[in-house]
């Protein structure tokens, strides 16, 4: 069975810098990659990047920089201009759209004792639908 | 063919608001983001923002996210873009532009370009 | 955002001679999913919108003469017109088309002798 798996990372030298990083374990092409946080896309979550393998990358502030890492996975920057940080209590969801196998979206966050330069544990934590 | 129609001059006070228009035909108008672009007289190109016309999700340069406001009207095919507070650094051709789905930002058609001129 | 250099800012050449001209980008345009570049080339003629030459780097729009011709890799692109036409004079500004924002160049003016 296809799984997501979803890392978060808070950047050691800026606080206010994270980065989510996103695969798909499972065999298929990859033909979108949508990251939200807040929730998952469509379910109360709030788009923050959309990543096409051919057209190219789409994000929403405060993204900053979404790429392709792998064939199967992606990083997304994420800057956050005020003084405190809301991303550490975040969730943060992607979908990876495949063919032939569907939508797959697991979600995840900063665990609360997160040093900078910690990241959450890669076990993936397949929530919602396998669309 | 594909056509984006933009009106070709408006003269505004500075302080003022303007909206500008760009009407498209022969491509479904709800299939493709529009953008907008600023060009200052014989200056280089900066992009304002894009709004999806399917169900008006903008995307905004951060550096104009004060300044313009995206919008459509359906019923006509037509993008809108509202400059807010205008100073003489508005003073500019505004361009719409859509793209033919080669990629999210290759601007493939664009209008004629609207000249605003900030002058009191 | 991506930093977009063009370079020179202008240049003048006579009809027939072979053009070169430089976009650097502060950081690569490599998509490494697909392996494409995803720079893009406009001309903008005088009193004109401008329009589309190249997209991924080195595929011409449709329409495009093939003098024009778009190449180079990761931060260091070049659009090269193999044979200069005196329907050439124009402005040619580079554009990632990488990721949001899209940027552009300042601009080459290419002028005819």
């Known amino acids: 069975t296809p799984e997501v798996w979803v890392q978060v990372q808070m950047e050691a030298t800026e606080l206010s810098s994270f980065t989510v990083h996103c695969g798909f374990l499972g065999p298929g092409s990859i033909s979108l990659v949508t990251v939200s946080w807040g929730g998952p896309d469509g379910a109360g979550g709030t788009k923050l990047a959309v990543l096409h393998p051919e057209l190219g990358t789409r994000q929403w502030a405060p993204a900053r920089q979404a790429r392709w890492e792998t064939q199967s996975s992606i990083s997304l920057a994420l800057e956050d201009s005020g003084a405190s940080s809301p991303f550490a209590n975040t969730t943060f969801c992607c979908k990876f759209a495949s063919f032939p196998e569907g939508s797959w979206e697991s979600c995840g966050s900063l665990p609360p004792s997160s040093d900078p330069g910690l990241s959450a544990p890669p076990t993936p934590v397949p929530i919602l639908r396998a669309d | 063919q594909v056509q984006l129609q933009q009106p070709g001059a408006e003269l505004v006070k500075p302080g003022a608001s303007v909206k500008l228009s760009c009407k498209a035909s022969?491509?479904?108008?709800?299939?493709?983001?529009m953008h907008w672009v600023k060009q200052r007289p014989g200056q280089g190109l900066e992009w304002i923002g894009e709004?999806?016309?399917?169900?008006?999700?903008?995307n905004y340069n951060e550096k104009f996210k004060s300044k313009a406001t995206l919008t459509v009207d359906h019923s006509s095919s037509t993008a809108y873009m509202q400059l807010s507070s205008l100073t003489s650094e508005d003073s500019a051709v505004y361009y719409c532009?859509?793209?033919?789905?080669?990629?999210?930002?290759?601007?493939?058609?664009w209008g004629q370009g609207t000249s605003v001129t900030v002058s009191s | 955002d991506i930093v977009m250099t063009q370079s020179p800012s202008s240049l003048a050449m006579s009809v027939g001679q072979k053009v070169t001209m430089s976009c650097k980008s502060s950081?690569?345009?490599?998509?490494?999913?697909?392996?494409?570049?995803?720079l893009a080339w406009y001309q903008q003629k005088p009193g004109q919108s401008p329009k589309l030459l190249v997209y991924?780097?080195?595929t011409r729009d449709s329409g495009v003469p093939d003098r024009f011709i778009g190449s180079g890799s990761g931060t260091d692109f070049t659009l090269t017109i193999s044979s200069v036409q005196a329907e050439d004079l124009a402005d040619y500004f580079c554009?990632?088309?990488?990721?949001?924002?899209?940027?552009f160049g300042g601009g080459t003016k290419l002028e005819i002798k």
């Open positions: 950081q690569s345009l490599l998509n490494s999913f697909n392996q494409r570049n995803f």
């Open positions: 554009q990632q088309h990488y990721s949001t924002p899209p940027t």
């Open positions: 991924f780097a080195s």
């Open positions: 022969g491509y479904t108008f709800t299939s493709s983001w």
């Open positions: 532009a859509s793209n033919a789905d080669r990629a999210y930002y290759t601007m493939d058609y």
């Open positions: 709004i999806n016309p399917s169900d008006g999700r903008t």
